[in-house]
C-alpha cells in the first residue's frame, strides 16, 4: 500500500474543552467524542512481506506537489 500523508504539525488553537471521563477530545473535529478504539493496531513491523500503512504519528515526506510539509490543524499534536 502506498504511503499516505502523515507529516502533521499542530497549529495554535484554543485549549481542548474538558470531556467527560468516557470521552476523548478529538484534535481534528475539536469536539469530545467516544474514545473508541484505543490506539489503532500497529501495522506489521518493517521487513514484513508487504508495505503496511503508516500511522499519523510517524514522520513522512510531504505528499502535495511543491508543499514543504503537509499540515492539518491538529492543536497540541506533535
Amino acid at each position: 500500500m502506498r504511503r499516505g500523508p502523515r507529516s502533521l504539525r499542530g497549529r495554535d488553537a484554543p485549549a481542548p474543552t474538558p470531556c467527560v471521563p468516557a470521552e476523548c477530545f478529538d484534535l481534528l473535529v475539536r469536539h469530545c467524542v467516544a474514545c473508541g478504539l484505543l490506539r489503532t493496531p500497529r501495522p506489521k513491523p518493517a521487513g514484513a512481506s508487504s508495505p503496511a500503512p503508516r500511522t499519523a504519528l510517524q514522520p513522512q515526506e510531504s505528499v502535495g506537489a511543491g508543499a514543504g510539509e503537509a499540515a492539518l490543524p491538529l492543536p497540541g499534536l506533535l
Epitope: 476523548c24 478529538d26 474514545c35 478504539l37 490506539r39 489503532t40 500511522t55 499519523a56 491538529l74 499534536l77
Partner: nanobody, 121 residues
Framework: EVQLVESGGGVVQPGRSLRLTCAAS????????MYWIRQAPGKGLEWVSY????????YYADSVKGRFTISRDNSKNTLYLQMNSLRAEDTAVYYC??????????????WGQGTTVTVSS
Amino acid sequence: EVQLVESGGGVVQPGRSLRLTCAASGFTFSTSGMYWIRQAPGKGLEWVSYISSSSSTIYYADSVKGRFTISRDNSKNTLYLQMNSLRAEDTAVYYCVTQSCGAGKCYPGVWGQGTTVTVSS
C-alpha cells in the same frame, strides 16, 4: 495487517455526484471512529468528515456541510462518502483514515492509499 483501500474516485463535472468507498481490514472496524481527509493538488491536508464507531456522532467541515454525507456499514467493514453538488475546489486525493485515541485525545491513525477526485468541466 491494518489495511484501508479507497475506491470510487474519478473525473466528474461540477454539480454531479460521486460515492467514495473505503474497505477496511486487519482491525476491529466496528469499534473505530473514522475520518475522510483530503489533499488538493499542491495544498495541505484538509479534514472532511468524521463518523463515530456506531454512526451516532457525525461531523463535517464547513466546506462540505450540506453536500457530503459520511456513512458506514460495520457488517461489511466499509466506510462511505457520498459527495453531491461537487465543485472544482473539491478536486483532491481523498483518504480514509482510522481514528486513534490515547491520553484523552483522538487523532488520525492509519491512512489508506487515497483515491483521486477531479471535478472539471
